[in-house]
Amino acid sequence: MNSFNYTTPDYGHYDDKDTLDLNTPVDKTSNTLRVPD
């Protein structure tokens, strides 16, 4: 088990604004420090 206890957000629970603010990856192409998919 991953020691970080990540939660999977229920996307249907959020409006558009909140969905855009979720901890989901931003950088789809670059090799900068980023959130793992």
Partner: antibody, heavy 114, light 112 residues
Framework: QIQLVQSGPELKKPGETVKISCKAS????????MSWVKQAPGKGLKWMGW????????TYTDDFRGRFAFSLETSASTAYLQISSLKNEDTATYFC???????WGQGTTLTVSS | DVVMTQSPLTLSVTIGQPASISCRSS???????????LHWLLQRPGQSPKSLIY???KLDSGVPNRFTGGGSGTDFTLKINRVEAEDLGVYYC?????????FGVGTKLEIK
């Protein structure tokens, strides 16, 4: 309601380090990312990157890699921006904002001068 | 990086008259999730920016309906159908589709 409250103005000398705080309230801090935005005096806005408040992983844009560090104190619902080896061109107002810039802090003015 | 081009840079408008700001991007802002992540902010003098419109045309909470946003692809517009005194400030369009997110230079709305 959602609020982001930043630390007060800073006056620093070149070469020093500053740490700006951004305390969030009114929502679950670890659900939503936090962005940082720079605004030099009389200039426009520049996105510095963001930090995943769940994993703690920062993402920096090219112009803000190296001397800049995003960090968290999740127990206090607080995000931090640290700038080291300060330069005159770091003089600006720094804003925290929830990831997609719909909610903003009031800004922290940093002046770097010898 | 995606370049966001705003025009005009300054807009001088009489209260009660309409105003329009154009924003063009150097690449399409239609994202792979089907959303066009073009947003508008207003920064009043001495204040932090405030979200006005998100996803091209959605009015943020508390924003009066005299503001409307439209456009698609690379060409977007913010319109105010009757300018009020509280509307003065700098309007920024910005894109959250392509990394890094980028802003227009801003359009300063002045009251005549």
């Amino acid at each position: 309601q959602i609020q982001l409250v930043q630390s007060g103005p800073e006056l620093k000398k070149p070469g020093e380090t500053v740490k700006i705080s951004c305390k969030a309230s009114g929502y679950t801090f670890t659900t939503f990312g936090m962005s940082w935005v720079k605004q030099a005096p009389g200039k426009g806005l520049k996105w510095m990157g963001w930090i995943n408040t769940n994993s703690g992983m920062p993402t920096y844009t090219d112009d803000f890699r190296g001397r800049f560090a995003f960090s968290l104190e999740t127990s206090a619902s607080t995000a931090y921006l640290q700038i080291s080896s300060l330069k005159n061109e770091d003089t600006a107002t720094y804003f925290c904002a929830r990831k997609s810039l719909f909610y903003w802090g009031q800004g922290t003015t940093l002046t770097v001068s010898s | 990086d995606v370049v966001m081009t705003q025009s005009p840079l300054t807009l001088s408008v009489t209260i009660g008259q309409p105003a329009s700001i154009s924003c063009r991007s150097s690449r399409s802002l239609l994202d792979s999730d089907g959303k066009t992540k073009l947003h508008w902010l207003l920064q009043r003098p001495g204040q932090s920016p405030k979200s006005l419109i998100y996803l091209v045309s959605k009015l943020d909470s508390g924003v009066p309906n005299r503001f409307t946003g439209g456009g698609s692809g690379t060409d977007f517009t913010l319109k105010i159908n009757r300018v009020e005194a509280e509307d003065l400030g700098v309007y920024y369009c910005w894109q959250g589709t392509h990394f890094p997110w980028t802003f227009g230079v801003g359009t300063k709305l002045e009251i005549k």
